[in-house]
């Protein structure tokens, strides 16, 4: 039975040209995290594999940096970066947990962070 929950940074906003950290945290399970995939809609951004390290998709290599931790830093943000981002935790023996983050990239200098929320 999958008992874990994923806590994410929830709905967040950031300024165009700036950077943002996408962060998820898996809790309430003793399952071993083997890999975390970061995806934007249907596109793979990056993978953090417990054994191998990081694989950054070539399409994003100039704008994505690994970390902190299992998180992902998006740099040089554009309005086109607005949308849903998913952290997909591959665990053993539980299986897959998915967290969702919605990022809004703003033209203005007012960019407030949304509250954290949990996905069971």
């Amino acid at each position: 039975m999958m008992t874990g929950t994923i806590e994410t940074t929830g709905n967040i906003s950031a300024e165009k040209g700036g950077s943002i950290i996408l962060q998820c945290h898996l809790s309430s399970t003793t399952a071993q995290v083997t890999q975390v995939n970061w995806e934007q809609q249907d596109q793979l951004l990056a993978i953090c594999n417990a054994d191998l390290g990081w694989h950054i998709s070539p399409s994003f290599k100039d704008r994505v940096a690994p970390g902190p931790g299992l998180g992902l830093t998006l740099q040089s943000l554009t309005v086109n970066d607005t949308g849903e981002y998913f952290c997909i935790y591959h665990t053993y023996p539980d299986g897959t947990y998915t967290g969702r983050i919605f990022l809004e990239v703003l033209e203005s200098s007012v960019a407030e962070h949304g509250a954290r929320f949990q996905i069971p």
């Epitope: 594999n49 054994d51 191998l52 390290g53 950054i56 998709s57 070539p58 690994p66």
Partner: antibody, heavy 127, light 110 residues
Framework: EVQLLESGGGLVQPGGSLRLSCAAS????????MSWVRQAPGKGLEWVSG????????YYADSVQGRFTISRDNSKNTLYLQMNSLRAEDTAVYYC????????????????????WGQGTLVTVSS | QSVLTQPPSASGTPGQRVTISCSSS????????VNWYQQLPGTAPKLLIY???QRPSGVPDRFSGSKSGTSASLAISGLRSEDEADYYC???????????FGGGTKLTVL
């Protein structure tokens, strides 16, 4: 010098078994994923199986799933491929190959490519 | 049949620039790293290009890789007779959880 040396190939009857070995030297074997790739006579390259540095993640091509088993012994710097229920279509030169991986001070990165290859060992399945 | 499609053959004269294409029937090239291998007659494959366009040390800058959408290309400029070989593109296919090679392109230097 980074080197991979395959052994264990030979002639085997259909339905038989064979175990290939790949001895690695010149690099820290336990830090790298490894793969087996084969090439049938006059044909192209076909990836067979891959294994992560610790052996915790293992992948197979559909064509060998359930028949072949990849493993590694990091203390012996050796990669293995146990091949059971062999078929005529398994006839090929089998190469072992080392995955590309680079490390900075803060992170290691992998690229899904293979930068060092052995010279191959021929497996012939025939009655 | 391979998920990655390459022309079976290509040719050029010494000094010429030749391009070999590699197209994907699925989305596996789109966000994945494409690698290129050269296999000279009777020898093991050699890595030419990794991560779309990176050259390992020792590979001449006459070889270059590029990618656009679901297609990748290997360009060889200043073609030489010793470039006559089979060339393979490859990538990791996340849907298959496996590494896939294109069918290979036999390059002939005329």
């Amino acid at each position: 010098e980074v080197q991979l040396l395959e052994s264990g190939g030979g002639l085997v009857q259909p339905g038989g078994s064979l175990r290939l070995s790949c001895a690695a030297s010149g690099f820290t074997f336990s830090n790298y994923a490894m793969s087996w790739v084969r090439q049938a006579p006059g044909k192209g390259l076909e990836w067979v199986s891959g294994i992560s540095p610790s052996g915790s993640s293992i992948y197979y091509a559909d064509s060998v799933q359930g028949r072949f088993t990849i493993s590694r012994d990091n203390s012996k710097n050796t990669l293995y491929l146990q091949m059971n229920s062999l078929r005529a279509e398994d006839t090929a030169v089998y190469y072992c190959a080392k995955a590309i991986r680079t490390c900075s001070l803060s992170h290691c990165y992998y690229y899904y490519g293979m930068d060092v290859w052995g010279q191959g060992t021929l497996v012939t399945v025939s009655s | 049949q391979s998920v990655l499609t390459q022309p079976p053959s290509a040719s050029g004269t010494p000094g010429q620039r030749v391009t070999i294409s590699c197209s994907s029937s699925s989305s596996n090239i789109g966000s994945n790293a494409v690698n290129w291998y050269q296999q000279l007659p009777g020898t093991a494959p050699k890595l030419l290009i990794y991560y779309d366009n990176q050259r390992p040390s020792g590979v001449p800058d006459r070889f270059s890789g590029s990618k656009s959408g679901t297609s990748a290309s290997l360009a060889i400029s200043g073609l030489r007779s010793e470039d006559e070989a089979d060339y393979y593109c490859a990538t990791w296919d996340y849907s298959l959880s496996g590494y896939v090679f294109g069918g290979g392109t036999k390059l002939t230097v005329l």
